[in-house]
Interface confidence: low
């Protein structure tokens, strides 16, 4: 069966919507009117991995476009990365491992940890008009908490 | 292939009263839980009420309770909420959905419909 998956927008707590900066980096920033068309939709997609009642492994692709939000070493730090892929291969139900987040739902919040670095999450600064990251502290300066936008297909 | 198409909504008056309908075909209706969720413009998903295979279990959430009753008939594959007193705050896209059965807001559905506009002003 093919992976079932959902479009989406999402916005960290305060209200940054999420946007492309460049070929392969997202940045958080408030949107109003007309701008919102600017922010990335997500194709969700529900994959293989760890799952409980309020854990859900999912992939995070750019819908319509062969790019997913990966996580990877860096100088020997995790790092949040846009990712090409061959579009004829992805989504699949088993996405490699820096692929998949936890979807993680708190007080109807969302937070995104990753499955390939446990307790890094991805992260938004408070300052507008930053890169979204991926971070290694929770209830901190970064914003690791997130509302998810359903979108029609 | 999993169809689920909903009808009913509108403009409406606070106060007022509108019956939403979901036609659902592609699998069978009779064997799952079925349910509303809704988003008002520019907000999250919000989690309406569900309803049982045999129709008997229904649940609602608490900004709706006692305002909205789900029903459906398993004999056409159709899935209603009937909504009452309707408050500008109703006002958003309704969706229903086939439901999978975990308990928390986002996870709670596998396939949706399209989706009925209800606004409700003056």
């Known amino acids: 069966a093919p992976v079932r998956s959902l479009n989406c927008t999402l916005r960290d707590s305060q209200q940054k919507s999420l946007v492309m900066s460049g070929p392969y980096e997202l940045k958080a920033l408030h949107l109003q009117g007309q701008d919102m068309e600017q922010q990335v939709v997500f194709s969700m997609s529900f994959v293989q991995g760890e799952e409980s009642n309020d854990k859900i492994p999912v992939a995070l692709g750019l819908k319509e476009k062969n790019l997913y939000l990966s996580c990877v070493l860096k100088d020997d730090k995790p790092t949040l990365q846009l990712e090409s892929v061959d579009p004829k291969n992805y989504p699949k139900k088993k996405m490699e491992k820096r692929f998949v987040f936890n979807k993680i739902e708190i007080n109807n919040k969302l937070e995104f940890e990753s499955a390939q670095f446990p307790n890094w999450y991805i992260s938004t600064s408070q300052a507008e008009n930053m890169p979204v990251f991926l971070g290694g502290t929770k209830g901190g300066q970064d914003i690791t908490d997130f509302t998810m936008q359903f979108v029609s297909s | 292939e999993v169809q689920l198409l909903e009808s009913g909504g509108g403009l409406v008056q606070p106060g007022g009263s509108l019956r939403l309908s979901c036609a659902a075909s592609?699998?069978?209706?009779?064997?799952?839980?079925m349910m509303w969720v809704r988003q008002a413009p520019g907000k999250g998903l919000e989690w309406v009420s569900r309803?049982?295979?045999?129709?008997?279990?229904?649940y609602y959430a608490d900004s709706v309770k006692g305002r909205f009753t789900i029903s459906r008939d398993n004999s056409k594959n159709t899935l209603y909420l009937q909504m009452n007193s309707l408050r500008a705050e109703d006002t958003a896209v309704y969706y229903c959905?086939?439901?999978?059965?975990?308990?928390?807001?986002?996870?709670?559905?596998?396939?949706w419909g399209q989706g009925t506009l209800v606004t409700v002003s003056s």
């Open positions: 592609g699998f069978t209706f009779a064997e799952y839980t």
């Open positions: 309803i049982g295979q045999d129709g008997k279990n229904t």
């Open positions: 959905a086939k439901y999978t059965g975990r308990i928390f807001t986002h996870h709670l559905f596998d396939y």
